[in-house]
């Protein structure tokens, strides 16, 4: 039975050219996290963290994505095209798969604020 809950940073905004932290947190389960996948709205993978071997950043994002903090992901040099949904997928044993959603809005405005609150989707 899957008892866990994914908490995410929810809906966030950040400035064009800036950076943003995409963060998910799995709670309420003792399941072992074997892998975390980060993917974009078009289902293209940005990065994967394997519990045994570490982070693999996909070549297309190598210059703009940094692993961490923790199991999160830092997206840098933001463009307007980065606006959209991002998904974290936690592969766990024995529970199975948990999935969280974050919506990122990249703003032209210099007063854009990056909210860092956690929420349960």
């Amino acid at each position: 039975m899957m008892t866990g809950t994914i908490e995410t940073t929810g809906n966030i905004s950040a400035k064009k050219g800036g950076s943003v932290i995409l963060q998910c947190h799995l709670s309420s389960t003792m399941a072992q996290v074997t892998q975390v996948n980060w993917e974009q709205h078009d289902h293209s993978l940005l990065a994967i963290r394997n519990a045994e071997l570490g982070w693999h950043i996909y070549p297309a994002f190598k210059d703009r994505v940094a692993p961490g903090p923790g199991l999160g992901l830092t997206l840098q040099s933001l463009t307007m095209n980065d606006t959209g949904e991002y998904f974290c997928t936690y592969h766990t044993y024995p529970d199975g798969t948990y999935r969280g959603r974050i919506f990122l809005e990249v703003l032209e405005s210099s007063v854009a604020e990056h909210s860092a609150r956690f929420q349960i989707p």
């Epitope: 994967i48 394997n50 071997l53 570490g54 693999h56 940094a66 692993p67």
Partner: antibody, heavy 128, light 108 residues
């Protein structure tokens, strides 16, 4: 041409120390995991340990047989990998190879790890 | 740690014959983390197969790999003189990375 060249092997007494080097060329060293593998005379291959790449903060991991005695490090500015061996034992006598570790996820979303480039090896003899 | 057991220890065959090498894991491993290497006397190992079945660059198609779970196989369809060597399987996940004990393919 992608190439790995080991050096630093030699004869050392039990309890002594030795530092092996591996010079890499022909590829972007900072992007790759690097492994050390050894082979005792007439025996099979034994994994010694590895250092991960820059993205993974150069995290190191070791085989139980060498943990606490051997230290793996790298200098990306020199495209070089090192193996510092302390408290050497006779059973550490072997040919030591450095190898490039290929760790990635394919379009099939499956993870892969293998060693696709190997050096020629350097011989370490521990004997009194 | 996962123990990889290769069999047979030695395989005596003639050029042109088919070689079938086995690698058995003490517990299930992901096929994508299973590789095969060839080693000739006085030389470094050379990658043959990765992901259990994908041939490395420059490896002839007479070499093929298969298997999943705990049982993996390296097949050489028609042995060439240069194929007589020692073959090792290797797994990377779960840690630590381990090698099989090797199978020597010798000329009969």
């Amino acid at each position: 041409e992608v190439q790995l060249v080991e050096s630093g092997g030699g004869l050392v007494q039990p309890g002594g120390s030795l530092r092996l080097s591996c010079a890499a060329s022909g590829f972007t060293f900072t992007d790759y995991y690097m492994d050390w593998v050894r082979q005792a005379p007439g025996k099979g291959l034994e994994w010694v340990g590895r250092t991960r790449n820059k993205v993974n903060s150069y995290y190191t991991e070791y085989a139980a047989s060498v943990k606490g005695r051997f230290t793996i490090s790298r200098d990306d500015s020199k495209n070089s990998l090192y193996l510092q061996m302390n408290s050497l034992k006779t059973e550490d006598t072997a040919v030591y190879y450095c190898a490039r570790g290929q760790y990635y996820y394919g379009s099939d979303r499956r993870g892969y790890y293998y060693m696709d480039v190997w050096g020629q090896g350097t011989t370490v003899t521990v004997s009194s | 740690e996962i123990v990889l057991t290769q069999s047979p220890g030695t395989l005596s065959l003639s050029p042109g014959e088919r070689a079938t090498l086995s690698c058995r894991a003490s517990q299930s491993v992901s096929s994508s983390y299973l590789a095969w290497y060839q080693q000739k006397p006085g030389q470094a190992p050379r990658l043959l197969i990765y992901g259990a079945s994908s041939r490395a660059t420059g490896i002839p198609d007479r070499f093929s790999g298969s298997g999943s779970g705990t049982d993996f196989t390296l097949t050489i369809s028609r042995l060439e003189p240069e194929d007589f060597a020692v073959y090792y399987c290797q797994q990377a996940v779960p840690s630590p990375l381990t090698f099989g004990g090797g199978t020597k393919v010798e000329i009969k």
